[in-house]
Amino acid sequence: SPSPVTPSPTLKELIEELVNITQNQASLCNGSMVWSVNLTAGMYCAALESLINVSDCSAIQRTQRMLKALCSQKPAAGQISSERSRDTKIEVIQLVKNLLTYVRGVYRHGNFRGLNDIFEAQKIEWHEHHHHHHHH
């Protein structure tokens, strides 16, 4: 018999979960690094593709499930997956924060005009990461 269809999470639910796991946190998943994603289209699939490789991290399991549901929501969703920046790795928490920025913008205004926020955040993260290693 066919399995019951789980309703896709709403943007609101995704925002709640992302705030829940990032609030007052300096790190997630023991500082695991993941591939950065270019947040131009297919955001949920791209984020899922990057986060799916993180194992043994209960903190992001619900987020992974939500992204999986959102990614498979439309037939073409899997085909418009954003490119991953194969040359840039960032911490899980930074990817999650970037996703939160994106989703908040989509929530507020359908077409999100604040993508620069994410690119800026990635630049800051990259700078801080390399600066940190330079001094240690």
């Epitope: 609101k12 705030v19 507020r108 205004h109 800051i124």
Partner: antibody, heavy 118, light 111 residues
Framework: EVQLVESGGDLVKPGGSLRLSCAAS????????MSWVRQAPGKGLQWVAT????????YYSDAVKGRFTISRDNAKNTLYLEMNRLRAEDTAVYYC???????????WGLGTLVTVSS | QAVLNQPASVSGSLGQRVTISCSGS????????VGWYQQLPGTRPKTLIY???FRPSGVPDRFFGSRSGSTATLTISGLQAEDEADYYC???????????FGGGTHLTVLG
Amino acid sequence: EVQLVESGGDLVKPGGSLRLSCAASGFTFTDYDMSWVRQAPGKGLQWVATTSNGGSGTYYSDAVKGRFTISRDNAKNTLYLEMNRLRAEDTAVYYCVKEIYPASIDFWGLGTLVTVSS
Amino acid sequence: QAVLNQPASVSGSLGQRVTISCSGSSSNIGRGFVGWYQQLPGTRPKTLIYGDTFRPSGVPDRFFGSRSGSTATLTISGLQAEDEADYYCSTWDDSLAALLFGGGTHLTVLG
């Protein structure tokens, strides 16, 4: 402890300009969308403007669109409101607020009074 | 700009329970994060509830937020004299791309 401290409120003539500042501390400023909310004497709360956490997404109420500009300096943990072509109806206490969820405020500043009068 | 609809005033006796409603539409309360704020005379607003139901630390559990469809409700149980204040609700409206506030409700606590 989260603190939001506004400054820059003053008495200004109609048509004049003013810049409000809000110094934020006690939280990771770059993680949160921030807004300005105002309250005219004896009236209710009215939203003015919102900026996304990085500053490139901005939203304005119809009452101030084209006259006010919200911005932030994440390096200085400071939120700004540039107010031009001020009118008598802009007279209010202006509050700087932190949004934990979109349009859901968890902290309020002390407020700064802007009086527009000739 | 449209506002969310709140009763102008409500009253209740000490120790009683009162509810304050905030009604909107499917484009705001129906899908948004609702906040509730208390403003005592001459002071800045204070957040009682954010994200529909969450209470910031320090806010007593006498204050309870809920939402059903396009109406949000703030319930205050065990009324105390210091609860006499103005109460406002807020949420985002996605069709207006605007943060909306209710017009405010004045709560009177009867001795």
